[in-house]
């Protein structure tokens, strides 16, 4: 028995070949002997049943001369899954058609971090097929009647070429995924005390009509609980602020990409935030983490102090040095002090390996007096 695979809604070609490679009489029937179509010696396609009943069935007249008499079934339905019989040259050939339906849950437009389940459904009780989907960038996901793709990323967007294999017979279909998300999952902003801070939240996709609402929650390092800094609405590319905290006095750009400005980096703002964006007609939310590290350099009571506040990595080093002098290195990464600093220009650096994350300079004029 020959097996043919077909996807619901598409077309399938069931083969029937003459051993003599020339035109001959043939008939295609259902397994219950009902006639579908055939050729009875005059080179004319004869259909069985009413035209409306068999308007989806056809053959390739151009192939008959070569001894090929395929049965073409268009707009495949699940109930087309059955055995078809081709009668020619006093023999019968059975062809098994397996029609499958592909469903995507929850759909092909998803949010970053969500999962997609691809399910193959069929009326026939076939053994497990192999389903394999390949992204144009090379990523491959495989399964059987159920294929799962978890923790989707923006990079998983675009066209996937999928193949269903059963008894060495293949059928392919395509799917276009659209994974909505932020360009970056996380970002860190390094600022000296008093500098203006800009947070940017660019989306990694372009949608003409985008509606939703968002909020930035902030957990300051020095605070016991997090606080909502701003809430906003999004309609197309238009951003409108609903509510903003009085301290800090944040400003938000009125159009995409999402952008926030903090007038000054102050020690009490150092910490991390989570911007969430809920999109209309989508379950779940998009998230982007943002971190603020603030550096403060001050001279007080004959001691020069450099301090960083906010989420720093253990690999980071804080150094305080005067030009042409040996550096004072912080052991605890976050504070370094020099007692009775010499007059002159001092520099504080926050670095990770050989990369300087930020630096701040202070002019020590005399003991107890300074100028940044």
């Amino acid at each position: 028995k020959t097996l043919v695979l077909g996807k619901e809604g598409e077309s399938a070609e069931l083969p029937c070949e003459s051993s003599q490679k020339k035109i001959t009489v043939f008939t295609w029937k259902f397994s219950d002997q009902r006639k579908i179509l055939g050729q009875h010696g005059k080179g004319v396609l004869i259909r069985g049943g009413s035209p409306s009943q068999f308007d989806r069935f056809d053959s390739k007249k151009g192939a008959w001369e070569k001894g090929s008499f395929p049965l073409i079934i268009n707009k495949l339905k699940m109930e087309d899954s059955q055995t078809y019989i081709c009668e020619l040259e006093n023999r019968k050939e059975e062809v098994e058609l397996w029609v499958f339906k592909v469903t995507f849950s929850p759909g092909t437009s998803l949010l970053q971090g969500q999962s997609l389940t691809l399910t193959l459904d069929s009326n026939s009780k076939v053994s497990n097929p192999l389903t394999e989907c390949k992204h144009k960038k090379g990523k491959v996901v495989s399964g059987s009647k159920v294929l799962s793709m978890s923790n989707l990323r923006v990079q998983d967007s675009d066209f996937w070429n999928c193949t269903v294999t059963l008894d060495q017979k293949k059928n392919w279909f395509g799917m276009t995924l659209s994974v909505l998300g932020f360009q970056k999952a996380s970002s860190i902003v390094y600022k000296k005390e008093g500098e203006q801070v800009e947070f940017s939240f660019p989306l990694a996709f372009t949608v003409e009509k985008l509606t939703g609402s968002g909020e930035l929650w902030w957990q300051a390092e020095r605070a016991s609980s997090s606080k909502s800094w701003i809430t906003f609405d999004l309609k197309n590319k238009e951003v409108s602020v609903k509510r903003v905290t009085q301290d800090p006095k944040l400003q938000m750009g009125k159009k995409l990409p999402l952008h926030l400005t903090l007038p000054q980096a102050l020690p009490q703002y150092a910490g991390s935030g989570n911007l969430t964006l809920a999109l209309e007609a989508k379950t779940g939310k998009l998230h982007q983490e943002v971190n603020l590290v603030v550096m403060k350099v001050a001279q007080l009571n004959n001691t020069l102090t450099c301090e960083v506040m906010g989420p720093t990595s253990p690999k980071m080093r804080l150094t305080l040095k005067q030009e042409n002098q040996e550096a004072r290195v912080s052991e605890e990464q976050k504070v370094v002090q020099v007692v009775a600093p010499e007059t002159g220009l001092w520099q504080c650096l926050l670095s990770e390996g050989d990369k300087v994350k930020m630096d701040s300079r202070i002019q020590v004029l005399s003991r107890g007096v300074n100028q940044t």
Epitope: Q196, K235, K237, E238, M252, G253, K254, K255, H259, P263
Partner: antibody
């Protein structure tokens, strides 16, 4: 062709009220942000107010907050500016402007003159 | 509100001159800045959006640049029809704010 035509300007006494209108044509009015910008005699441009077509949100300059109200009637393709408690410093040419898809004021009317004087 | 400081407030130049007008924002505004040209008794004309994007129909002698707080409008070779007042507008957030204007006069 996109066109904006302001009307309703005139002479009004301090403390008085006036309603400006801006009739729009040549584009889908309800899709766009519309604004009022004014220019006092011999002075620069001064943004007064904006209203979103999508959300209906309104925005006003601090100098007119509580005195001026921007509104729109999408069925009539008309933008309004209701001005009350008028002051001498409100004397200006008032322009109606349409935002483009990138939210910049790209098309302006010819303006209507408002004179506040006793 | 974001303040926009435009300089110079006026300048005298000749036809063919290269003219540069600057605009500084009191805080970062990305590239959300527009430039407008206004002639006496006329409505402003939109020249440049997003700091550097020339509007259709605007001659290529006009160009804009900048990001954050500092922006520039340049007219590479001044033509007689370019004598006018030029305004920058911050379109980052409400309230929208204009620069005070730069009047370009004939020398």
């Amino acid at each position: 062709e996109v066109q904006l035509l302001e009307s309703g300007g005139g002479l009004v006494q301090p403390g008085g009220s006036l309603r400006l209108s801006c009739s729009a044509s040549g584009f889908t009015f309800s899709d766009y942000v519309m604004s009022w910008v004014r220019q006092a005699p011999g002075k620069g441009l001064d943004w007064v107010s904006s209203i979103s077509g999508l959300t209906g949100n309104t925005y006003h300059a601090d100098s007119v907050k509580g005195r001026f109200t921007i509104s729109r009637d999408n069925s009539k393709n008309t933008l309004y500016l209701q001005m009350s408690s008028l002051r001498d410093e409100d004397t200006a040419v008032y322009y109606c402007a349409k935002d483009n898809e990138d939210y910049y004021m790209d098309v302006w009317g010819k303006g209507t003159t408002v004179t506040v004087s006793s | 509100a974001i303040q926009m400081t435009q300089s110079p407030s006026s300048l005298s130049a000749s036809v063919g001159d290269r003219v540069t007008i600057t605009c500084r924002a009191s805080q970062g505004i990305r590239n959300d800045l527009g430039w407008y040209q206004q002639k006496p008794g006329k409505a402003p004309k939109f020249l440049i959006s997003a700091a550097s994007s020339l509007q259709s129909g605007v001659p290529s002698r006009f160009s804009g640049s900048g990001y954050g707080t500092d922006f520039t409008l340049t007219i590479s070779s001044l033509q007689p029809e370019d004598f006018a007042t030029y305004y920058c507008l911050q379109d980052y957030t409400y309230p929208r704010t204009f620069g005070q204007g730069t009047k370009v006069e004939i020398k």
